[in-house]
């Protein structure tokens, strides 16, 4: 149904920046406005099928929410309509447009760029750094400290409370308690254990409305096992001659891990020894002042063709060893390619 005679329509549009990342528009509407968000590709190029989401959850059309491929309308906006709206490509889930929407008490002037302090508005809570509210899953090893934060504002200043799996969460609910730092909008749990797994929701509210954010915590159990290496790391790399390259290796281990980076080499034309063990040279290993974090990265500077080949991240602890490998391909510099092309050489892929 179209907006009634008393309702003002306030439009906000963002251009889809093609292959560039989407920009988060921070916009304000007045209570009772019809919110209209538009997401248009440059030059009218088709975006393909899209879906609209609010705070990460898909929006379903209703008598009040009108969902179109490149346009979203919310009739008679209320404080509950505040949040982060995104238009995404239905198949790839690539974010095409991003809006952080606040709904204030007064009808909107239609101009959110006057540079005035936002807290002067009387209104429902809103995230003060909405772009930071998208890290929803946290996986940490047992015994680590976990901190969830939900910085928000509103007028009057909103209160913050926490739920675990939908129920009120208080210090007595866990051994070791929790630290609630209301001014920092944070919940801190020290020395987490598997029973701390679950969904943690911050609820920020004042008399004009409430917003919430849910984080999922997974606690990786400490059990005696060899190091676990993150899948997909290190990743294969292709580099131009003379450029810099980094290989990354994420290691999870309860017992103190020993990390080494190896490069596979040939000895007398053979890659493996008589016993089948590959020939390798150690490029990086623990030293007196090296941290595990530093060992998780192998940096190669000013690469040459000799640097091409197979690299292995090897991690061991008292229980055993794990390793992942990746390949480096080194391509000639562009000028070199052009010179050889002019000389009539042919390169086969």
């Amino acid at each position: 149904e179209p907006p009634g005679p008393e309702q003002r329509v306030v439009r906000r549009a963002a251009e889809v920046p093609g292959p560039e990342p989407s920009q988060q528009e921070q916009v304000a509407f007045g209570s009772g406005d019809t919110v209209e968000l538009s997401c248009h590709p440059p030059g009218g190029a088709p975006t393909g099928p899209t879906v609209w989401a609010k705070d990460g959850t898909g929006l379903v059309a209703s008598h009040r929410i009108l969902v179109g491929p490149q346009r979203l309308q919310v009739l008679n906006a209320s404080h509950e309509d505040a949040g982060v709206y995104s238009c995404q490509h239905r198949l790839t889930r690539r974010v095409l447009c991003h809006f952080s929407v606040r709904v204030t008490d007064a009808p909107s002037s239609g101009d959110d760029e006057d540079g005035e302090d936002v807290a002067e508005d009387t209104g429902a809570p809103y995230w003060t750094r909405p772009e930071r509210m998208d890290k929803k899953l946290l996986a940490v090893p047992a015994a680590n400290t976990v901190r969830f934060r939900c910085p928000a504002a509103g007028n009057p200043t909103p209160s913050i409370s926490w739920l675990k799996n939908g129920k009120e969460f208080r210090g007595e609910h866990r051994i070791g308690g929790i630290k609630l730092r209301h001014q920092q909008w944070s919940l801190v749990m020290e020395s987490v254990v598997p029973s701390d797994r679950g969904n943690y929701t911050c609820v920020v509210e004042n008399k004009f409305g409430s917003i919430r954010q849910t984080y999922t915590l997974d606690v990786l159990e400490r059990s005696p096992h060899r190091p676990i290496l993150q899948a997909g790391l290190p990743a294969n790399q292709t580099a131009i001659l003379g450029s810099d390259v980094e290989f990354h290796c994420k290691v999870y281990s309860d017992a103190q891990p020993h990390i080494q980076w190896l490069k596979h080499v040939e000895v007398n034309g053979s890659k493996v020894g008589p016993d089948g063990t590959p020939y390798v040279t150690v490029l990086k290993t623990a030293g007196a002042n090296t941290t595990d974090k530093e060992l998780e990265v192998l940096s190669l500077h000013n690469v040459t063709f000799e640097d091409a080949g197979e690299y292995t991240c090897l991690a061991g602890n008292s229980i055993g060893f794990s390793h992942h490998s990746a390949w480096l391909v080194v391509l000639p510099a562009e000028e070199e390619l052009m010179e050889t092309d002019e000389a009539g050489s042919v390169y086969a892929g």
Epitope: S22, V95, R129, R132, D134, E294, V297
Partner: antibody, heavy 118, light 107 residues
């Protein structure tokens, strides 16, 4: 060791565009947001905007919305800032700085000096 | 935008002194304040975030305090290497904003 290595100084003519790079090393680039900051000669610091390297989502200071475009190339762990329609007012030192969630800029690049002059 | 005001452009001190640099926000920033040190020709360095949390490796003579709109960076016993520019920043709400800076110099 965490390092943010920025591209070298640049002298450009008014009206032109420039692209400054910031190569991150010593950490996993997708674990931190990348911010960009302007410091005009003898002046304070101005936040230009930030980018989430995971999904490329950017947030800009309105003042720089039509001036700067932030991008990131995950494969090379490099963040970029393009500045367009340059004037003498854009002459400054530009820094990239990483931030974990909400906790301040813990590592900064060495700065890139941009001079706009005809 | 939130305006961060550092009322003293310069502060004179002697080695061994205790000095307090102040910063006032134009609205409540809920302890979302960071402090940076910048020496000539160098990039800023993070000292304190969330008003009072010391960044890794920062000497314990640097402490931060405050809430609401008023924040203080205290250097307990100034060393020669502490003579520098100090900026406050609110990292609570976008757009993030910095103070104009306070230069700490020798008397």
């Amino acid at each position: 060791e965490v390092q943010l290595q920025q591209s070298g100084p640049d002298l450009v003519k008014p009206g032109a565009s420039v692209k400054i790079s910031c190569k991150a090393s010593g950490y996993t680039v997708t674990d931190y947001y990348m911010n960009w900051v302007k410091q005009s000669h003898g002046k304070s610091l101005e936040w230009i905007g930030d980018i989430n390297p995971n999904n490329g989502v950017t947030t800009y200071n309105q003042k720089f919305k039509d001036k700067a475009t932030l991008t990131v190339d995950k494969s090379s762990s490099t963040a970029y800032m393009e500045l367009r329609s340059l004037t003498s007012e854009d002459s400054a030192v530009y820094y990239c700085a990483r931030e974990e969630d909400f906790d301040g800029f813990d590592y900064w690049g060495q700065g890139t000096t941009l001079t706009v002059s005809s | 935008d939130i305006v961060m005001t550092q009322s003293h452009k310069f502060m004179s001190t002697s080695v061994g002194d205790r000095v307090s640099i102040t910063c006032k926000a134009s609205q409540d920033v809920s302890t979302g304040v960071a402090w940076y040190q910048q020496k000539p020709g160098q990039s800023p360095q993070l000292l304190i975030y969330w008003a009072s949390t010391r960044h890794t490796g920062v000497p314990d003579r640097f402490t931060g305090s405050g809430s609401g709109t008023d924040y203080i960076l205290t250097i307990r016993s100034v060393q020669a290497e502490d003579l520098a520019l100090y900026y406050c920043q609110q990292h609570y709400s976008t757009p993030l904003t910095f103070g104009a800076g306070t230069k700490l110099e020798l008397k």
